[in-house]
């Protein structure tokens, strides 16, 4: 199915994400004890480190091109709060489009 096809994409994107996070941490002077939100791979897409009060925007991840190849890709945000990252807004399916009646290929 398309989820299985996505596994390879995920592994590649995850590796790239961890590299990006490392570079961003160095640029921003982030370490484990820094206030704010560490960069993370949420198993769907990559989120750069952020300071408390900062909103981070990302384009819809590659996974949704598999679900909806013809759809314009949307944007998802997370807020960095004192308690860590908020959940995505909107949630991925609403932001990025998902046809639940599309048959698996």
């Amino acid at each position: 199915g398309s989820m299985a096809h996505s596994d390879g994409i995920f592994k590649k994107e995850q590796a790239m994400c961890l590299e990006k996070i490392q570079r961003a941490n160095e640029l921003m002077g982030f370490n484990d004890s820094s206030p704010g939100c560490p960069g993370m791979w949420d198993n769907i897409t990559c989120w750069k480190p952020a300071h408390v009060g900062e909103m981070v925007l990302v384009s819809c991840p590659e996974l949704f091109r598999i679900f909806n190849p013809d759809q314009d890709m949307g944007v998802v945000s997370r807020n960095c709060t004192e308690d860590g990252w908020s959940e995505p807004f909107p949630h991925y399916f609403d932001a990025c489009g998902f046809d639940e009646y599309e048959s698996e290929t």
């Epitope: 989820m3 609403d94 639940e100």
Partner: antibody, heavy 120, light 107 residues
């Protein structure tokens, strides 16, 4: 149409274990997050746990953390809730619900629930 | 965790009247606020997502508004089938939470 059918509820003594199941049909189960939400008799809704589409992300309410485990078998279109060290305050109708997302989402379709009674 | 407070706890109204239900969050929920209706003996039903987005199959008399920490569900003209309990739910910060509910009953 989306259908969620919970099972596994019953009467259990405090300290014992129970496993709930939720059989899903009418949608591509392996693409959706899934939630458990409970409702004590005559009370409001309490969110319990969520699992991402592939089981890679699991999150719990503080009241059940360390006692309950959410899991899924995408080959069987089934969601599970393993409940250990049950307490009287766990007595509730347990609903499984589809999360409209791959990671967490908000519950959009709900089952009819299975009743768990913890009593000696 | 984010605590959701709903008011009033009970709203006694007549069919045809307007119902205004409030949900207040202890911290900002960044738009991830949703409304559910529950009738006795039934599972909850999603009414409104993301504070104000309507859903197909839900009557137009149901509408939502608000942002940040203060949200409102409005039923423009109550129908007999609208007498039920209404819950708000935040999916912004884990652990997710529900409000305690507002019961709309017949005056």
């Amino acid at each position: 149409q989306v259908q969620l059918v919970e099972s596994g509820g019953g009467v259990v003594q405090p300290g014992r274990s129970l496993r709930l199941s939720c059989a899903a049909s009418g949608f591509t189960f392996s693409r959706f997050a899934m939630h458990w939400v409970r409702q004590a008799p005559g009370k409001g809704l309490e969110w319990v746990a969520v699992i991402s589409y592939d089981g890679g992300n699991k999150y719990y309410a503080e009241s059940v953390k360390g006692r309950f485990t959410i899991s899924r078998d995408n080959s069987k279109n089934t969601l599970y809730l393993q409940m250990n060290s049950l307490r009287a305050e766990d007595t509730a109708l347990f609903y499984c619900a589809r999360g409209y997302d791959v990671l967490t989402g908000y519950p959009d379709y709900w089952g009819q629930g299975t009743l768990v009674t913890v009593s000696s | 965790e984010i605590v959701l407070t709903q008011s009033p706890a009970t709203l006694s109204l007549s069919p045809g009247e307007r119902a205004t239900l409030s949900c207040r969050a202890s911290r900002a929920v960044f738009g991830n606020l949703h409304w559910y209706q529950q009738k006795p003996g039934q599972a909850p039903r999603l009414l409104i997502k993301y504070a104000s987005q309507s859903l197909s199959g839900i009557p137009a008399r149901f509408s939502g508004s608000g942002s940040g920490t203060d949200f409102t569900l409005t039923i423009s003209s109550l129908e007999p089938e609208d007498f039920a309990v209404y819950y708000c739910h935040q999916s912004s910060m884990l652990p997710f939470t529900f409000g305690p509910g507002t019961k709309v009953d017949i005056k």
